[in-house]
């Protein structure tokens, strides 16, 4: 996309990491077949992708989860792509929802989110889910990334 | 994206093709409203997209399938985006899973996969599914593509 | 992506809008955290994204809906990404289908569509669904966009 020193390619693809934390923010790692083009995008605290340059970015996340209707709350499983810009409150960019499966012990489902957004220097994006304990971390099932247009 | 002779755009979008083969690798065709930007990306043997240039690519696949819980194995329907680099074994880049529907005769569901990956010259990507006989080949339901950043 | 006056970035991301119209074409708005890079892409009549320049575009849509098997027709919920080129009939680029949920009063599900397509100057893309009354318009649930390669 962006060629030359003035316009280096900026892209990232990180892999889900199981976490003992009770937070609803998913954890990610630079492992397996990951992508981190350069230091103009970084994975911070294993939870957010932070960009150094302003611009339009295509941001995406995929979350696979395994849940059961009887064992889960009545509310659906929701994955949210969220933005934290410097000096601003967090906001939701994208959400997807899937009702829990009736399959036993649980039924797997995959969610994909993606969209084009303007990011400011220092902006961070992260992924939130209603129940992180239901997320599938087998390789390739859950990932998160972006690319600068 | 990449302008001029030095940086031609490289992109492909191919359409699913029903196959009598028993292989779990999906078959594709340059038909309908397909995209094949130039010979720097090619569809080989109707099953894999092969690139000539090293670089970062956004690769995606969409698979629609129709299955029934009683008529299928207990395992979910899984679609995998796979990579074969020259001189290396195949590996899975992305996977998505959906539990079979209880709808009769079968319930349709759609899976979308997408991510940014570094590809080497001669690398091929392909899509694998647990049961190709369940895949829907109606217009627009199942497709596969990439674009070079 | 495309730098300089000759190659401005062209991208859009619009947000779903509830509509009293009975049409199956979804309505969109430039509201919330939307993107409209410049006047080389426009949202027309709140229903279609129209481009002024020929080229390859990655076009995507996400639709979240809430439906119930008993209250819906037997046919699945289908979302279609459609193209209207000047002087041509409309055509379907991408479709995704999800069987209705058995959850009461309704079960939420999300669909993601995306692919690379060649668009002509004046071409418009829009999103069609089988039942627009089932679409979820909460923040981030349903969106539509494109980016020029």
């Amino acid at each position: 996309m962006q060629k030359g020193d003035q316009n280096p390619q900026i892209a990232a693809h990180v892999i889900s990491e199981a976490s003992s934390k009770t937070t609803s923010v998913l954890q990610w790692a630079e492992k397996g077949y990951y992508t981190m083009s350069n230091n103009l995008v970084t994975l911070e605290n294993g939870k957010q992708l932070t960009v150094k340059r302003q611009g339009l970015y295509y941001i995406y996340a995929q979350v696979t989860f395994c849940s059961n209707r009887e064992a889960s709350s009545q509310a659906p499983f929701i994955a949210s792509l969220c933005l934290k810009s410097p000096g601003r409150f967090e906001r939701i960019l994208l959400r997807a929802a899937n009702t829990h499966s009736s399959a036993k012990p649980c039924g797997q489902q995959s969610i994909h989110l993606g969209g084009v957004f303007e990011l400011q220097p220092g902006a961070s994006v992260f992924v939130n889910v209603t129940d992180p304990s239901q997320v599938s971390h087998g390789t390739g099932f859950t990932s998160f990334g972006l690319l600068k247009l | 994206m990449q302008k001029g002779d030095q940086n031609p755009q490289i992109a492909a979008h191919v359409i699913s093709e029903a196959s009598s083969k028993t292989t779990s690798v999906l078959q594709w065709a340059e038909k309908g409203y397909y995209t094949m930007s130039n010979n720097l990306v090619t569809l080989e043997n109707g099953k894999q997209l092969t690139v000539k240039r090293q670089g970062l690519y956004y690769i995606y696949a969409q698979v629609t399938f129709c299955s029934n819980r009683e008529a299928s194995s207990q395992a979910p329907f899984i679609a995998s985006l796979c990579l074969k680099s020259p001189g290396r074994f195949e590996r899975i880049l992305l996977r998505a899973a959906n539990t079979h529907s209880s709808a009769k005769p079968c319930g349709q569901q759609s899976i979308h996969l997408g991510g940014v990956f570094e590809l080497q010259p001669g690398a091929s990507v392909f899509v694998n599914v647990t049961d190709p006989s369940q895949v829907s080949h109606g217009t627009g339901f199942t497709s596969f593509g990439l674009l070079k950043l | 992506m495309q730098k300089g006056d000759q190659n401005p970035q062209i991208a859009a991301h619009v947000i779903s809008e509830a509509s009293s119209k009975t049409t199956s074409v979804l309505q969109w708005a430039e509201k919330g955290y939307y993107t409209m890079s410049n006047n080389l892409v426009t949202l027309e009549n709140g229903k279609q994204l129209t481009v002024k320049r020929q080229g390859l575009y990655y076009i995507y849509a996400q639709v979240t809906f809430c439906s119930n098997r008993e209250a819906s027709s037997q046919a699945p919920f289908i979302a279609s990404l459609c193209l209207k080129s000047p002087g041509r009939f409309e055509r379907i680029l991408l479709r995704a289908a999800n069987t209705h949920s058995s959850a009461k009063p309704c079960g939420q599900q999300s669909i993601h569509l995306g692919g690379v397509f060649e668009l002509q100057p004046g071409a418009s893309v829009f999103v069609n669904v089988t039942d627009p009354s089932q679409v979820s318009h909460g923040t981030g649930f349903t969106s539509f966009g494109l980016l020029k390669l």
Epitope: Y33, T139, G140 | C82, P86, R88, F89, E90, R91, E118 | -
Partner: antibody, heavy 123, light 113 residues
Framework: QVQLVQSGAEVKKPGSSVKVSCKAS????????ISWVRQAPGQGLEWMGG????????NYAQKFQGRVTITADESTSTAYMELSSLRSEDTAVYYC????????????????WGQGTLVTVSS | DIVMTQSPDSLAVSLGERATINCKSS????????????LAWYQQKPGQPPKLLIY???TRESGVPDRFSGSGSGTDFTLTISSLQAEDVAVYYC?????????FGQGTKVEIK
Amino acid sequence: QVQLVQSGAEVKKPGSSVKVSCKASGGTFSSYAISWVRQAPGQGLEWMGGIIPIFGTANYAQKFQGRVTITADESTSTAYMELSSLRSEDTAVYYCARGASVWDGPAEVFDYWGQGTLVTVSS
Amino acid sequence: DIVMTQSPDSLAVSLGERATINCKSSQSVLASSNNENFLAWYQQKPGQPPKLLIYSASTRESGVPDRFSGSGSGTDFTLTISSLQAEDVAVYYCQQAYTTPFTFGQGTKVEIK
């Protein structure tokens, strides 16, 4: 516990073929790379080729191309290596070795090995 | 093919002392995409199959004692046994896992002095 159990020793005449089997247990056979590595008496290790059963297409070292065939039977969790046109210098211990699974990578590193099968080629 | 060259061919070290084995590849085995070195180390005792010790140049396989460590990048790699034990007497091989054919070094025999 992952185990790779190979077939027994073989004595073969020059020009003939040998087929060695490798039965896997304790893992999801179809998603792991199975390679074949040989070791001539008192010599080092030599990779011959390998296969991931779910993909079914074998990779071969150029040196053995056309003379070796590697297959896998998912139903019995067994991999096979057939070497044809045998000559005396093919006398070696033949090992099957498992790489990481296709989703854990790298499949090109071998974490479990069979006990080895001695193939003697002699007239 | 990538040629792997180990040095020395054999090594005699006192119990409790450090043993160092070098391995040089004829071309880089570093993947630019994720900075991973596709290099592994194996231990082979007489009459046994090889055993994986280290992969990705420096990652210890589970169950391998921490006296074994790997280092290096690109074309030059080292296996270190920080404090040699009697059970470490074996032949050690490096292997490039970068591209087919996956090739091994000629081996280094480690004995007790």
